[in-house]
């Protein structure tokens, strides 16, 4: 559910044209001849966290030493890249880039908010869609699963395209595409439920283009702590957008008196944002801010990258853990508002939904909780990790593991509390989601630590694919299916409607515990994998002949 595909996409890959690549090779030779192993040539050999004042680059992948900054244009300074590039290269002007970077990051983050707002507006009006189209629970699960499946398949494709073509054009086209499809889907006649399913699939493709490419642009616009900050803002757009999706869905349908209008809000905002991206986002080169970006050309084949990633145990286990998070967030996001509505029917504080609008209050509250817990989760997760790093090198995966295991307890308690107290259930949701969401930013850092920059785009795409495949691609459908299965062997009653869905959702805490175990497994290999990645980065700074990746 919650954009784990973009949680680690911070770095770019190859340059845009072969000519640029050729110029770069010539430049590297010249720089080495001049004795330059500064920012334009290679990074220093210092490990993470070992630096003199002013010579440390803080990226999501840790701290790497670089040569002290001198006057622009001299070897060993950030400015020398422009000088060395020669007249043929088109380097963005630092001044204009500096002015526009903040606006660009803000627009990209806004676009991410809209991606998720659009996705979860459907969840916010799910009951109404079910009522209008005559959709059964299995059909409602299918809607979300089709979206995630298409997203999952499209993400690696856009990751590939994003490394080779104009990224902001792909981004804008993606936004315009999903906006048009979502807007059109609000007019689908009752008899064409399959058209609604198809439209969600197409929206998934459109949104995949954004989620895979936007973080790499942010990664190229900023460096040091600023990059971490900007990516955190970008990630916070996920819970914010998801929460706003629920809120928009339920409040717009209430105001307009028809659920169709809820699907017309995000497309209008999407068109505006797409246009702003074309205007305000600068056409940065890949690896612009991270000075190694120019040197760290992808030198290995895609197949070799994949083999290396599969052998990277920290990466594999953290990817499996993100799949568990994805499974739980996808299922809970889809079914919890309906579950709470049924709980109130059992408690006789609400009536069975006979005609739309249905369960608006639950979607609204759940949306607000998702918003706030997303923010709280990112902040507490990052804070806890920063504190724990003083105690142990394995802080990142351990904080994630504790968060997951703690979350599982509170997710279990939701189903206990819901039987007697909706307020109690909401409190459990609040704590459970906060703990679950606390690992977002940290998971990004883990990937950056253990994967070398030239493989990060591939790593992000593969992690995106697996987290969706094993996670939220099937979980909403699976929960609906299990709920139906239980209900078929019980008598018809509001109590069993509530219980069957609750029993089905009980699968989530078990998967979350499994995810916690995967994070603990990550902790076992994290230090050695991180050291290996740093060693390889240092090797990449040497002449190509000596590079063994």
């Amino acid at each position: 559910m919650m954009c784990l595909e973009c949680a680690s996409a911070a770095a770019g890959g190859a340059e845009e044209e072969e000519a640029d690549a050729e110029r770069r090779r010539r430049r590297r030779g010249a720089q080495r001849g001049a004795g330059g192993s500064g920012c334009c040539g290679a990074r220093g050999a210092g490990g993470a966290g070992v630096s003199a004042a002013g010579d440390e680059v803080q990226t999501l992948s840790g701290s790497v030493r670089r040569a002290p900054t001198g006057p622009p244009g001299t070897p060993g300074t950030p400015g020398c890249a422009a000088t060395a590039k020669g007249p043929g290269a088109q380097q963005p002007k630092p001044a204009s880039l500096g002015r526009g970077r903040g606006a660009a990051a803000a627009i990209l983050s806004l676009g991410n908010v809209l991606n998720y707002l659009d996705r979860y507006t459907v969840a916010g009006v799910l009951l109404d869609i079910q009522q209008h189209f005559g959709v059964k629970d299995r059909g409602a699960g299918l809607l979300q699963s089709v979206f995630i499946c298409s997203f999952m398949v499209a993400a690696p494709i856009f990751g590939y395209l994003g490394d080779r073509f104009n990224r902001k054009v792909i981004l804008s086209c993606g936004i315009f595409f999903w906006s048009a499809v979502t807007f059109s889907s609000s007019f689908i006649p009752q008899q064409y439920f399959w058209l609604l399913v198809l439209s969600r699939g197409l929206v998934g493709i459109g949104e995949a283009s954004y989620s895979t490419i936007a973080p790499t642009i942010i990664g190229d616009l900023f460096t040091k702590n600023t990059r971490t900050l900007m990516l955190s803002v970008f990630y916070f757009a996920i819970p914010l957008g998801s929460g706003l999706g629920y809120i928009t869905g339920s409040s717009v349908k209430q105001a307009a008196g028809a659920w169709h209008w809820a699907l017309r809000v995000s497309p209008v905002l999407g068109m505006i944002t797409g246009t702003l991206i074309l205007i305000l986002v600068p056409a940065t080169k890949r690896g612009h801010a991270d000075q190694l970006g120019d040197q760290l050309k992808a030198r290995t084949s895609w197949l070799r990258d994949m083999k290396a990633l599969i052998r990277n145990r920290s990466y594999v286990f953290s990817s499996l853990a993100t799949s568990a998070v994805s499974f739980a967030t996808g299922a809970l996001g889809m079914w919890i508002p309906l579950y709470l509505h049924r709980a109130q029917v059992v408690q006789k504080t609400a009536e069975t939904c006979n005609s739309p609008p249905c369960g608006a209050k639950d979607s609204l509250i759940f949306g607000a909780i998702t918003c706030f817990t997303g923010f709280l989760g990112v902040v507490t997760g990052a804070g806890a990790t920063r504190w724990c790093r003083l105690k142990t090198q394995r802080a990142d995966p351990l904080v994630c593991a504790v968060g997951m295991l703690g979350s599982a307890i509170f997710i279990c308690l939701i189903f206990v509390a819901a039987k007697s107290s909706i307020v109690g259930a909401y409190i459990c949701i609040f704590v459970g989601e906060t703990l679950l969401f606390s690992n977002w930013a940290i998971t990004a850092d883990i990937l950056m630590y253990v994967v070398i920059p030239t493989r990060r785009a591939t790593a992000v795409a593969l992690q995106s694919f697996t987290s969706h495949l094993l996670g939220d691609a099937g979980s909403p459908y699976l929960i609906g299916f299990i709920s139906d299965l239980i209900r078929q062997s019980t008598k018809d009653s509001p109590l069993w409607e509530f219980l069957s869905l609750g029993y089905a959702l009980m699968l989530c805490p078990f998967v979350v515990v499994l995810g916690g175990m995967f994070f603990l497994a990550t902790a076992l290999f994290f230090v050695s994998d991180r050291a290996r990645a740093e060693q390889q980065v240092n090797q990449l700074a040497m002449p190509p002949a000596s590079v063994k990746v």
Partner: antibody
Framework: EVQLVETGGGLVRPGSSLKLSCATS????????MSWVRQAPGKGLEWVAL??????????NYAESIKGRFTISRDDSKSRVYLQMNTLRDQDTATYYC????????????????WGQGVMVTVSS | DIVLTQSPPTLSVTPGESVSLSCRAS??????IHWYQQRSNESPRLLIK???QSIAGIPSRFSGSGSGTDFILSINRVESEDFSVYYC?????????FGPGTKLEVK
Amino acid sequence: EVQLVETGGGLVRPGSSLKLSCATSGFTFSDTWMSWVRQAPGKGLEWVALIKDKNSNSEANYAESIKGRFTISRDDSKSRVYLQMNTLRDQDTATYYCTRHEDFYYYSGYYFDYWGQGVMVTVSS
Amino acid sequence: DIVLTQSPPTLSVTPGESVSLSCRASQGISTSIHWYQQRSNESPRLLIKYASQSIAGIPSRFSGSGSGTDFILSINRVESEDFSVYYCQQTYSLPLTFGPGTKLEVK
């Protein structure tokens, strides 16, 4: 062949109760939405109640005119749908039809693709 | 509730003629309209679903059209067995409602 057979009609006094039954065959009943539609003598058709399948929480919907007095239910093991009518009024006098909604596995149509032969309910003092 | 109005209430035609029966909704309902035929002393049967989609076993002379608020049921060259009452029904929103019917009679 799809078959819907209604039973349980008759003459009753205002304020009394009656339970209509509809036996079905020829299709997968447990996956199908069912409705009752009535027709007063010489008048048009009026939808009364709808019951969805278990995959839709066996949710029931009612017309405003009968809400609180009539209850629709189903027994998947017997492939039967029922209409429990309480506090009957003169204006409830009608032929009651058991109807089936067309099913598409993931969703269902709200229209009626098959109708029973109908059962007469007369409410009179 | 969505109110359906059918016109004319009664239509007198001679066999072989082609006729159009109208159904108007009180608000836009896209194509969520369905047509039923009820012969004397018989149960209704589905003729057309979703304004224009034909039903298996229904003669091809029956066709439907329209979208939004105005809908038409057309019978091309009326046959003797077509003389009956025709109802439209909306499924756009609950409660499900029927039109008052149009009676097609022999001229």
